[in-house]
Amino acid sequence: SAPGEDEECGRVRDFVAKLANNTHQHVFDDLRGSVSLSWVGDSTGVILVLTTFHVPLVIMTFGQSKLYRSEDYGKNFKDITDLINNTFIRTEFGMAIGPENSGKVVLTAEVSGGSRGGRIFRSSDFAKNFVQTDLPFHPLTQMMYSPQNSDYLLALSTENGLWVSKNFGGKWEEIHKAVCLAKWGSDNTIFFTTYANGSCKADLGALELWRTSDLGKSFKTIGVKIYSFGLGGRFLFASVMADKDTTRRIHVSTDQGDTWSMAQLPSVGQEQFYSILAANDDMVFMHVDEPGDTGFGTIFTSDDRGIVYSKSLDRHLYTTTGGETDFTNVTSLRGVYITSVLSEDNSIQTMITFDQGGRWTHLRKPENSECDATAKNKNECSLHIHASYSISQKLNVPMAPLSEPNAVGIVIAHGSVGDAISVMVPDVYISDDGGYSWTKMLEGPHYYTILDSGGIIVAIEHSSRPINVIKFSTDEGQCWQTYTFTRDPIYFTGLASEPGARSMNISIWGFTESFLTSQWVSYTIDFKDILERNCEEKDYTIWLAHSTDPEDYEDGCILGYKEQFLRLRKSSVCQNGRDYVVTKQPSICLCSLEDFLCDFGYYRPENDSKCVEQPELKGHDLEFCLYGREEHLTTNGYRKIPGDKCQGGVNPVREVKDLKKKCTSNFLSPEKQNSKSN
C-alpha cells in the first residue's frame, strides 16, 4: 500500500474541527503580480509581505507595490503601505531584515530617473514605523548589515562606490571608490576589492584586496593581482593570478589577511573556477572545476588551516561559475553532506558522506521501493536525490532537500530509485537517521515543510490545477492525514513557515482567479490544537547518531566522538514547543587512522586507511611555504581531521620546524603590505 495508508496508522482525533478553528484566510486587495514575504525577528510572529504589480504602458512601466504586516504569524494582515508613503518598492533588493532579533528592516524605493540618489525606508521596531531617508547615491546592491552590529550598514553604489552607515542608514559616507565586491568579516571588518584602471570586469585578475577594521578611517592592502575573494568560517580565501600565465591559485588567510599561505590545490585557467561549497571554523569544502566545459570538477576538503587539501570526490557535478551544484549540507546530522556526480555515461548519481567528506557512498535503496528503468539490476540500485540541478533543468521537482538542525536526523527530498537520477516524475522520500536509511513518504512531487522541531511535517501536492487540501504527519512521515483548508481551491504558489522549524503555523500562499480579476490569498493554519499537550520526558527516546553496528565498540563514532540524542517518539503526539533544545550526550572515541587525513606530500590509496608518500616526493625534504616562512615538515603522513575529538588509540607523530627562511608563495609577504589612513 502507499505510504501512510496501511491499517496501523493511528488517526489524530477530531483534527478537522481542531484545524478548522485554527485556519485563517486573508485576501489581499491586490491585482496579482509578485509577492515576497519576510520574517522579522525570531519568535516575534512578525511577517512583512510586499506585493508588486507592474503595468507595462507604451513608453514606460508603471509600478505599484503594497506592504502588509502581520504580528500573529500570518493569521491577520494589516495594510501598512501608508507608512512608506505609498512608495513603489524595488523587489530586486528584497526586504533587508536585520540580524538576530534587532527588529530592523530596510526597504529600497524606486526613484525617478533624474534624482540625485536613491531612497530607503528604515524601521527599528519590527516594521511598526518607518523613517524615509534619501540616499546620496543610487544603490547597486541590497544594504548589508554587519553581523556584529545591526546599526552598521554597507552598500555599493551604481558608480562602484563603497558606502557605509554607522547609524542604521541615517547618514552615509563613501569610504572608497572603484569597488567591485565588498563583504563584512568578523569584528565589523570590511573586505573589498578595488580596480585601478578601467572597471571590475576589465581588471579581473588585477584587482587589489583591501581591508578596513574601523569602518573606513584606515585601510590596509592585503592582496594584489586578485581575481576574487570569499569568506568561509574563519578562513579568508583569495584567488590570485600567477606571475607567468593566466592561471590562478587559491591563497588562504586565517588572520584577516595579515599573512597568507598558498593552498595546496590545483591552479585553474581562465575558463575554470573555484567554489567554496561549505565552510565552518574547522575546515572547508572546496570545488575545483575541471578544464574544459565538462560540467564537473573535484571536491577537496581542507585541514584545520585551510592549506593542505585531500581529494574528497571526483566528477562532482557543478555546471558553470555561479551555476548549479547539488551540494547540500544535511543540517540535521553532524558530518553529513549530499551531492551529485556526473558519471562517465553522463548520467547523474547522488552520493552521500557521513564523515565530512572522508568517504562518499551511494544512498541506500528504500525498503519500500522498486528499482526504476534506469537500473540494470532490478534488485540492486540506489536512491538518487533531486536538488538544485534538477530544479534548474525544469524537472517536476518543486523543492530542494530539506533538513533542520533541531529536527534531528530528519531529511526530506524528492528522488528516484535506480542507477541514476531519472527524468520521470519523482516521489518524496524521508530519512529519520540523517541519510543512512530512506523510506518513500509521499507519492509524486510535493512541497513540504517541518514544524515544531519535527513534531509535524506538512506537505502540499505539486499540481498545475488549483488545490484546497493540505497533508500533515505527526510521526515523521509514516502516516498522513488530509485536511481541506478551503472550499474554493486556489492556484498554489508557496508554503511559508517561520525559519528555524519551531513554529506550529504554516501559511499557504496562492491566488484566486475569476473571470475579470485575480487576487493574492493566504491561509494560515495553526497546528497547536493537534498537538494538544506539551511533550514530557516519556515522549522522548534515545537515539545514537551514525549507528551502523550496535555490536561494534566504535559504533556511532564520527570525527572522534559519538552522540546520543533524545528524540521524540514517533507515536507521541505532543508539542516540542518554541523553547525546545536538542538534548545530546557526546562520548569521546579512541583514535584510529580514520581520524587522520593525509598530510602534505601523502595520499590514501583507494580502499586503504593508511597514508603513503607521494611517489614524486619520495626521498625529498618536505619544505613548503607557510605564513610567508619556509617550513620543514617531519611527518609520518597523518594530520588530525579538523574538528575530530578522538583521544588515545593511534597517535601518529608530526612535527613542523620553522626554517627561518622567507618565502612569498606568489603573493604579498607581510612586510610588503602597505597601509594608509583617510
Epitope: 496501523e8 520526558e537 551514525h546 551502523t548 550496535p550 517518539r569 507515536s571 550526550q585
Partner: antibody, heavy 124, light 107 residues
Framework: QVQLVQSGAEVKKPGASVKVSCKAS????????MHWVRQAPGQGLEWMGW????????RYAQKFQGRVTMTRDTSISTAYMELSRLRSDDTAVYYC?????????????????WGQGTTVTVSS | DIQMTQSPSSLSASVGDRVTITCRAS??????LNWYQQKPGKAPKLLIY???SLQSGVPSRFSGSGSGTDFTLTISSLQPEDFATYYC?????????FGGGTKVEIK
Amino acid sequence: QVQLVQSGAEVKKPGASVKVSCKASGYTFGGYLMHWVRQAPGQGLEWMGWINPMSGGTRYAQKFQGRVTMTRDTSISTAYMELSRLRSDDTAVYYCARGKRSSGWYEGYGMDVWGQGTTVTVSS
Amino acid sequence: DIQMTQSPSSLSASVGDRVTITCRASQSISSYLNWYQQKPGKAPKLLIYAASSLQSGVPSRFSGSGSGTDFTLTISSLQPEDFATYYCQQSDVSPITFGGGTKVEIK
C-alpha cells in the same frame, strides 16, 4: 559471550534499602540500556526503569519514583539498582536485562539478555 | 499507562499442536510489541521483537503478527520444551508494561 551476572540473594527488614549489582561482559556496556524488571512470587513481570550507561540518564516507572535509584560504573561495566524504604510486598526476584537495539534506536525492541535474577526477601 | 491483556491466561495443549496466544493493548502501540518465554526458576527469554521479528537463536516455529492494538504469538507445532509461561510486553510508551502471562501446560 554476552552475559549479565547479578549479585547474590538478600534478606532485608522493612524500611531498609537493598542494592543489587549487575555486571555486564561480552559487549560494549555503554551501547545498550540496562532495564530492571522484578517478579513477585507467583506473579507476572513488572518493569521498574532503565539506566543509559553512556550518559547515566535514567527513566523510572512512576510507581517506584522516589524509592529507586539506578546507577552505573562504566569502568567495571556494572549497573546498580537500589530500592529504599522496603516493604514486604517488595519481596521478589529482581532482574537486570539489556535493552535490544535496532541500529541507533535504543528502545522499543525488547530485552534480549537477562541476568540470572537476585532474590530479595523483605521480612521482619 | 497502557494496559496489556493476554488471553487465555492458561491453556492445555499436546505436543504437535498449533497454539495461538493473543495480546491486546489498551491503545495503539504500532509494532512495538515483544514476546517472552519464561520457565520456572529461570529468567525470561526474548522470542519475538517488534511484533513479528524472530530473535536470533529462536526456533522458526515461533511467529508473531499484528499491529496497532491486537497481536498474536503462534507456535506452529508445540514441542516438549515449549511448555512455559509466555508474556507480551509493549515498549512504545513509557512505562513499559507486560501482559499478565499465558501458561501453556501439557494436556
